[in-house]
């Protein structure tokens, strides 16, 4: 039975040209995290594998940095980066847990972080 929950940074906003950290955390389970995939809508951004380490998709290499931890740092943000991001935790023996983050990239300096929330 899957007992874990994913906590994410929730709905966040950031300024155009700036950077942002996408962070997820899996709790309430003893399952082993074997891999975390980061996706932006229908694009694979990066993978962090427990044995192989990080793989950043070549088309995002200039603007995506691994970490901190299992998180992902997006740099040189553009308005086109606005949208949904998913952290997909592959675990053993539980299976797959998915967290969702919505990022809004703003032109002005009114960006602020939203509250944390949980996805079961």
């Amino acid at each position: 039975m899957m007992t874990g929950t994913i906590e994410t940074t929730g709905n966040i906003s950031a300024e155009k040209g700036g950077s942002i950290i996408l962070q997820c955390h899996l709790s309430s389970t003893t399952a082993q995290v074997t891999q975390v995939n980061w996706e932006q809508q229908d694009q694979l951004l990066a993978i962090c594998n427990a044995d192989l380490g990080w793989h950043i998709s070549p088309s995002f290499k200039d603007r995506v940095a691994p970490g901190p931890g299992l998180g992902l740092t997006l740099q040189s943000l553009t308005v086109n980066d606005t949208g949904e991001y998913f952290c997909i935790y592959h675990t053993y023996p539980d299976g797959t847990y998915t967290g969702r983050i919505f990022l809004e990239v703003l032109e002005s300096s009114v960006a602020e972080h939203g509250a944390r929330f949980q996805i079961p």
Epitope: D42, Q43, L44, D51, L52, H55, Y92
Partner: antibody, heavy 118, light 107 residues
Framework: EVQLLESGGGLVQPGGSLRLSCAAS????????MSWVRQAPGKGLEWVSA????????YYADSVKGRFTISRDNSKNTLYLQMNSLRAEDTAVYYC???????????WGQGTLVTVSS | DIQMTQSPSSLSASVGDRVTITCRAS??????LNWYQQKPGKAPKLLIY???SLQSGVPSRFSGSGSGTDFTLTISSLQPEDFATYYC?????????FGGGTKVEIK
């Protein structure tokens, strides 16, 4: 240099058994998931089975479930496919392939031919 | 199971031609789509992974695009060594599935 070398293929009668091996070298075998993929004569590619790096998770195509068993011995850097209750439609070249990040198959063996016929 | 439909099943082209092969998934697979080249009597060779990433050592005339359900493999200028069969494969979920293949022949 990454190398995958299959062996164990041959001619077997319907209902018989065969065990394929895939000897891996040139990389840290236990860090990678591995798959078996087959190709019937003149046909396309068909995924058969996969196993995680630790061997804790295994996956099968419906066509072989209950008849084939995938396993690995990380101390010997070897992948196995135990094939029981073989049928004529299992006749194919069987390839082992390395699967980094469980997303793509970047290295393949040369294949071993399994022929099921009476 | 996710069905992968490749088209065309075969095509004839000349050296220097631009060739496009398409692959459609029966449901969204994000960008978990790979392309392989296979020559007669040989093992498949990875060309493109995760829809658009060029595998190391593969010539830049090969490119991949698409996401969701529709994907494309393009060979910008066909070379003599490119005459082969090409397969797409989804790795979004098990069972992993391949397209039926596209045979690229000399015109």
């Amino acid at each position: 240099e990454v190398q995958l070398l299959e062996s164990g293929g041959g001619l077997v009668q319907p209902g018989g058994s065969l065990r394929l091996s895939c000897a891996a070298s040139g990389f840290t075998f236990s860090s990678y998931s591995m798959s078996w993929v087959r190709q019937a004569p003149g046909k396309g590619l068909e995924w058969v089975s996969a196993i995680s790096g630790s061997g804790g998770s295994t996956y099968y195509a419906d066509s072989v479930k209950g008849r084939f068993t995938i396993s690995r011995d990380n101390s010997k850097n070897t992948l196995y496919l135990q094939m029981n209750s073989l049928r004529a439609e299992d006749t194919a070249v069987y390839y082992c392939a390395r699967e980094p990040y469980d997303v793509w198959m970047d290295y393949w063996g040369q294949g071993t031919l399994v022929t099921v016929s009476s | 199971d996710i069905q992968m439909t490749q088209s065309p099943s075969s095509l004839s082209a000349s050296v220097g031609d631009r060739v496009t092969i398409t692959c459609r998934a029966s449901q969204s697979i994000s960008s978990y789509l790979n392309w392989y080249q296979q020559k007669p009597g040989k093992a498949p060779k990875l060309l493109i992974y995760a829809a658009s990433s060029l595998q190391s050592g593969v010539p830049s005339r090969f490119s991949g695009s698409g996401s969701g359900t529709d994907f494309t493999l393009t060979i910008s200028s066909l070379q003599p060594e490119d005459f082969a069969t090409y397969y797409c494969q989804q790795s979004y979920s098990t069972p992993l599935t391949f397209g039926g293949g596209t045979k690229v022949e000399i015109k």
